[in-house]
Amino acid sequence: IFPLAFFIYVPMNEQIVIGRLDEDIILPSSFERGSEVVIHWKYQDSYKVHSYYKGSDHLESQDPRYANRTSLFYNEIQNGNASLFFRRVSLLDEGIYTCYVGTAIQVITNKVVLKVGVFLTPVMKYEKRNTNSFLICSVLSVYPRPIITWKMDNTPISENNMEETGSLDSFSINSPLNITGSNSSYECTIENSLLKQTWTGRWTMKDGLHKMQSEHVSLSCQPVNDYFSPNQDFKVTWSRMKSGTFSVLAYYLSSSQNTIINESRFSWNKELINQSDFSMNLMDLNLSDSGEYLCNISSDEYTLLTIHTVHVEPSQETASHN
C-alpha cells in the first residue's frame, strides 16, 4: 500500500519509516472509519505539518518548512487512511511525527519515526601521485556515517584511512589506499546501514603486455559475476593514462546500448558486448600508446576497475631505419 518508503512496526502505535534524501515518502496512519474526521500531523509535538477537518485542508498555521510538501490521500480518508504523503524529504525532517485522528466515534494518536538516509553513488578512482599509486574510494554525500572496509586479495585490511568532511546534512568521505608496486586485487565496500545499501569497488591489475609498434593489442574486461547483474543499468568506460591523467577512449551505456568511440583505432566487439564481455582492441600501435589502460564498469551498486599496462616497443624495421 505504501510503496515509497519502508517501515518497521514497533510497539506503542509507533512505526519507523526510512526515506531517502530528496525523495517522497509516506508516513502511515490508519484509523477506524467514522464521520467528522479531524487529522492533525505534528512534528516533535510542536510544529504543525498538516491539518484537515470539516472536509478540507486547513494549512493557515502550517509550519513554513512543510509548505507545498504535504498532502493526504483524500479519497481514502473515509476508509480510515490518514497517511501523509511527504515530498522531498531532507535530513532536517528526521524525527517523530504524531498523527492525531478524531472522529465522531473516537480519538487515536499514532507516532511515526522518520529516519532519512543519503547514499549518492560512490566511486572508486585510481590515481598516480608522483611515483605513488593510490586507490580512492569516495562518496560525495552519505548519511548516516557509513562503514568502509578494504580487502586485499579477499583478505580484510585493518589500516583504513578515512578523510571526512561533514556538511549541514551529510558526510563526504574519501578513503585512500596506497597500492604502489602491488599486483594484488583490491576491494572496497561502503555500507549505509540505515538504507541497507552496499556499494563495492573492485580493482584488478592484469599482467603487463609487451607489443611491437604497428601490432594490435587485445585488452580484456569482463565483470565479476558476484557483482554484475545485466538487468541493472551500468556504464563501461575505457580510458588511457597519459602524464597522470586519464583520457577516455570509448564508453558504453547499457540503458541505451550506445557505444561512443573517441579513438579511431579502438574497436569493440558488439557480439562480445551482448555477452557482457567488454574487452577491446587497439589497432596499429605506436610508441605513444605505451601506458596504463583502465576499464571501468560502474553501476549504482559497484565499480569494477581493471588495469592493463601496455609497453609498445619499436619494430625491427623501425630500429634498423634509425
Epitope: 467528522e36 505534528k42 477537518y53 470539516k54 472536509g55 498555521s61 492525531y100 478524531g102 472522529t103 480519538v107
Partner: antibody, heavy 121, light 107 residues
Framework: QVQLVESGGGVVQPGRSLRLSCAAS????????IHWVRQAPGKGLEWVAV????????YYADSVRGRFTISRDNSKNTLSLQMNSLRVEDTAVYYC??????????????WGQGTLVTVSS | DIQMTQSPSTLSASVGDRVTITCRAS??????LAWYQQKPGKAPKLLIY???SLESGVPSRFSGSGSGTEFTLTISSLQPDDLATYYC?????????FGQGTKLEIK
Amino acid sequence: QVQLVESGGGVVQPGRSLRLSCAASGFTFSDYGIHWVRQAPGKGLEWVAVIWYEGSDKYYADSVRGRFTISRDNSKNTLSLQMNSLRVEDTAVYYCARDRSSGAMGYFVYWGQGTLVTVSS
Amino acid sequence: DIQMTQSPSTLSASVGDRVTITCRASQSISSWLAWYQQKPGKAPKLLIYKASSLESGVPSRFSGSGSGTEFTLTISSLQPDDLATYYCQQYNAYSYTFGQGTKLEIK
C-alpha cells in the same frame, strides 16, 4: 462517564478580574478541545473561546478578545478562563463544553452545569 | 461574523404533533450546523450535528436537514419531554454563532 465541572463564578465589580476553572473527568482530556460558552440571564447562547487539545491553538469571540485568556493543564485535566477588565455585559452563566475532537470541529458534545458570573457595581 | 436567524421564536404544539423549526444563515455554511436542546435550568444538549447526523443516544424522532443557508429541525411526534428551547449553531467558521433560540411549549 464524561464530566465537566465549572467553578470560580461569583460577583465582581466592573473592571476587575475573575478566573474560572473547569475540571474534566471520564475521558482522555489531552485528546479533546474545550470551549467556553456563556448565556446571559434569560438570553441565548454565545460562544466565548476554544483551546485545542494540546493547548497551542486558542480562538476567541470578538467580544472578549484581548480581555479573556483560555488555558489548560493537561497533566491536571483542568481548563481555565482568565477574565480581565470585566464589563456588566459579561454577566452570564459560563459553561465549559467538550468539542467532538481536537477543538477543530467547533460544536459541543458534552457540557458542564455552568457557573454564574455577575458583574455589578 | 455569520448571523443565524431562527424561526419561530416561540412555538406551541400538542403531544404527537410534527414540529419544524427553521434556521437561516447569513452566508453559506455548507452542512456545518448543530442543533441543541436546552431544558429550563439545565445545560444544553447536542441533538444533531453536520445538519442531519443524529447524535448517539438522541431519540430518532429528532431529525435535521438542509445545507448552505437553510436548515430545519423536525420532531416527528412531539413528546412531553421535548418541552425546551432549541438552538441552532454554525461551526463553519470562527466565531461560532448560535441562533436566538426557539422556545417550544406544549399545548
